[in-house]
Interface confidence: low
């Protein structure tokens, strides 16, 4: 399929102008290459009429232009003074020859319609209301008034002043006069449908003294707005149907031959194919609303319509707005996992791609909720605190320059299953949808922390160990202290690193962290995790309670600690102030080097983020064993 997109059918009338917009993929080559508009001949040859290289054919001289808009990845062909000879098949395309990338456009130019003299032309969209104005002389002030529709030679009455209404106009047509006006009456026809189009005659009086007016009513199908979007990106349908339907249920549907299948409506209906990737948001009290769809797929391409009706379903004679969505498969947005699986008690690390040109943009992670319209409240982000219920188990790790950030969620429960969105405050096309599936665990977790009853005493030394299996032998192990703006890496000591990898002893693979001396602000959540470079793996979390040195101080069991963590005031969860007077015990120099490197990486981005990069140990009292 060609990645060039434009309007399939363009129609106009003689003497008028048309403006045709063609879309192309946003690449440097495409922005600079030749753009052309050619006419398809019977012999299969496409004769250039105008191109961006400055060529202009004789028949287009003085009446056409081609303008490239590289910032929008579009080019526009304007053609004026149309004649019926312009009817035909055309191509808009890119490339040095007319056989390159193109899109077929059909142009139809029709004659100016001929109406009887003094015909007033009314042009209205489907679903709207027309008010036809009928003038008469004073002599017919008390005579019968009527409106009829021409069908061949006959004129069938639509409505008259005796209160007759044609059944097909029932509840849609009214005849009235305004105020004290004695020379004009009006007919309103609402909920217009295509078959209402045609020539109408309004009449006051009978016989030769009757006053007659001709009215031509044109009922327009909505002209679809073209939307060109990349695979895996997102699209927003902005729907403005007017005040008259402000209180009716709204919907977005997708055209399917003769029907239009509802994708989402404000009554809670939602197509399962869009589960987890759609939001409908009312914009104001005037009936405006928008529908956002993320994670665009090839099969999402097609014709869409929004509308309003009390049933929340498409109804003939109600206003609609239309779009044609093209999904460009030559996407710059990388393919990422759409389903991530985890087990209860375990963890997941979700990689979120973003536009690498926008590394300083703010990153967010939100949980799509299937309320009636769908919504996506932020759970964590750079400069956004972790939401309630996620304290101690959710962190966002930015990796500046890599074009991705990682979100880690641990202590998983089956309630965490659902859809999540990765997003930034920058390029809104780079929104990705992930489905998290959490199953019941069937075996022990890979990472285990001892002691599980983690209570440290102020002023004393406290060591906590994380046991890992041999499969993590070659990966980097770390401890970090969780706070509301991330999980900050601490110096730690890997017991297993000293052994030969050939003889990995499953029971003695330990990475430990020591708090020495323990301070009140050391209380909180700590994570043990594994990673390979910028790729984060499994994590486990433990809450360390800190208590005063008292005789016979009671131990807090881990479940109480977790409960306390949930109730702890937000202030306690914030990062403590930097302390540089900690004991620096003997450390493997390799660990020191790693730590310094991490510290620097963290410092560069320190104030651009509120989540920890695989970040600094500053602000923690952790030192190694």
């Amino acid at each position: 399929q060609s990645p060039i997109f434009g309007p399939q059918d363009v129609s106009s009338i003689e003497g008028n102008s048309v403006s045709i917009t063609c879309y192309y993929p946003d690449t440097s080559v495409n922005r600079h290459t030749r753009k052309y508009w050619c006419r398809q001949g019977a012999n299969g040859y496409c004769a250039t009429l105008i191109s961006s290289n400055g060529y202009l054919s004789k028949e287009y001289s003085g009446r056409a232009s081609l303008i490239n808009f590289p910032e929008n990845s579009t080019f526009v062909i304007n053609i004026a003074h149309l004649t019926q000879e312009d009817t035909g098949s055309y191509k808009c395309g890119l490339g040095t020859t007319n056989r390159g990338l193109f899109f077929d456009v059909s142009l139809e130019v029709s004659q100016v319609p001929e109406f009887p003299n003094d015909t007033h032309v009314y042009t209205k969209d489907i679903g709207r209301t027309v008010t036809i104005e009928c003038r008469f002389k004073e002599g017919n002030a008390h005579s019968k008034k009527s409106l009829c529709k021409k069908r061949g030679e006959a004129c069938e009455v639509v409505i008259d002043s005796t209160e007759y209404v044609d059944p097909s106009y029932k509840d849609r047509a009214i005849l009235f006069m305004k105020g004290t006006s004695r020379d004009i009456f009006y007919v309103n026809i609402s909920h217009l449908i295509p078959s209402d189009a045609g020539l109408y005659v309004c009449q006051a009086g009978e016989g030769p003294s009757a006053d007659k007016n001709n009215a031509d009513l044109q009922v327009l199908e909505p002209e679809p707005e073209l939307l060109y979007k990349d695979l895996r990106s997102s699209v927003t349908f902005e729907c403005d149907l007017g005040r008259e339907v402000a209180n009716d249920a709204k919907y977005l549907c997708r055209k399917n031959k003769e029907t239009c299948d509802v994708i989402i409506n404000t009554l809670g209906k939602r197509d399962p194919a869009f589960e987890g990737r759609i939001l409908l948001t009312p914009r104001d009290d005037n009936g405006r609303f928008s529908v956002l769809i993320t994670g665009l797929r090839k099969e999402d391409a097609g014709h869409y319509q929004c509308g309003a009706h009390s049933s929340g379903l498409p109804q003939e004679g109600w206003p609609v707005q239309a779009w044609q969505l093209f999904v460009n498969e030559e996407s710059t947005i990388p393919n990422s996992r759409s389903v991530v699986k985890g087990v209860t008690g375990g963890s997941v690390a979700i990689v979120c791609p973003y536009n690498p040109k926008e590394s300083s943009s703010l990153k967010y992670w939100c949980h799509w909720e299937a309320d009636e319209n769908g919504r996506c409240p932020v759970l964590v982000g750079t400069q956004a605190l972790v939401q309630e219920g996620y304290e101690g188990r959710l962190a966002l790790f930015d990796q500046p320059g890599s074009g991705a950030y990682t979100v880690i969620l641990n202590q998983l429960t089956t309630q965490d299953s659902g859809f999540y969105w990765c997003l930034t405050d920058g390029d809104s096309r780079w929104r990705t949808t992930i489905e998290l599936q959490v199953a019941e665990a069937t075996k022990k977790p890979d990472l285990e922390v001892t002691p599980q009853n983690a209570t440290a005493v102020i002023g004393e030394t406290f060591t906590i160990s994380c046991h890992y299996p041999c499969k993590f032998y070659s990966q980097e192990k770390y401890w970090c202290k969780w706070s509301n703006d991330g999980c900050h890496i601490l110096p730690s000591h890997d017991e297993g690193a000293r052994q030969s990898s050939v003889s990995c002893d499953q029971s003695s693979q330990i990475v430990s962290m020591t708090l020495n001396p323990v301070k009140k602000e050391d209380e909180g959540w700590y994570w043990c995790g594994v990673k390979e470079g910028q790729v984060y793996g499994e994590t486990t979390a433990i809450y360390v309670a800190v208590e005063e040195r008292t005789r016979g101080s009671p131990h807090i069991n881990p479940t109480d600690a977790n409960a306390r963590a949930k109730d702890a005031p937000e202030e306690e969860a914030m990062e403590s102030s930097v302390r540089e007077d900690e004991n620096k015990a003997n450390l493997d120099p390799r660990l020191f080097a790693d730590e310094r490197e991490i510290q620097n990486a963290g410092d560069q981005a320190q104030e651009n983020r509120a989540s920890g990069n695989a970040g600094s140990a500053g602000g923690q009292s952790g030192s190694s064993k």
């Epitope: 927003t236 948001t281 809104s428």
Partner: nanobody, 121 residues
Framework: EVQLVESGGGLAQAGGSLRLSCTAS????????MAWYRQTPGNERELVAR???????HYVDSAKGRFTLSRAQDKNTVDLQMNSLEPDDAAVYYC???????????????WGQGTLVTVSS
Amino acid sequence: EVQLVESGGGLAQAGGSLRLSCTASGTISKIDVMAWYRQTPGNERELVARIFSNDVTHYVDSAKGRFTLSRAQDKNTVDLQMNSLEPDDAAVYYCNAQIWSDMRGRMDTYWGQGTLVTVSS
């Protein structure tokens, strides 16, 4: 659309105080973060302090102990009390608000016009 209006900038002596105020108006549901940034000529805007929707405050090291961020009851006004001002604090101070938009499925960032703070030694 959201508008941010700053006030309170001006000239202060080194060691003196100034109070900056920022009010958000327009279509506001819930402001997730309100912050003050500052910028000196030729440098990028840098964060000074911010307050989150649950009233947790965060200060950069240079602001700790000298600057205090507070928010009005309606949560749409934030004040930055700057004490013990130093010549290095001279800059244009910008108010920043971040508001989650369900409609766009993203966090929208808004900026004020900026207010100039001059510190004479």
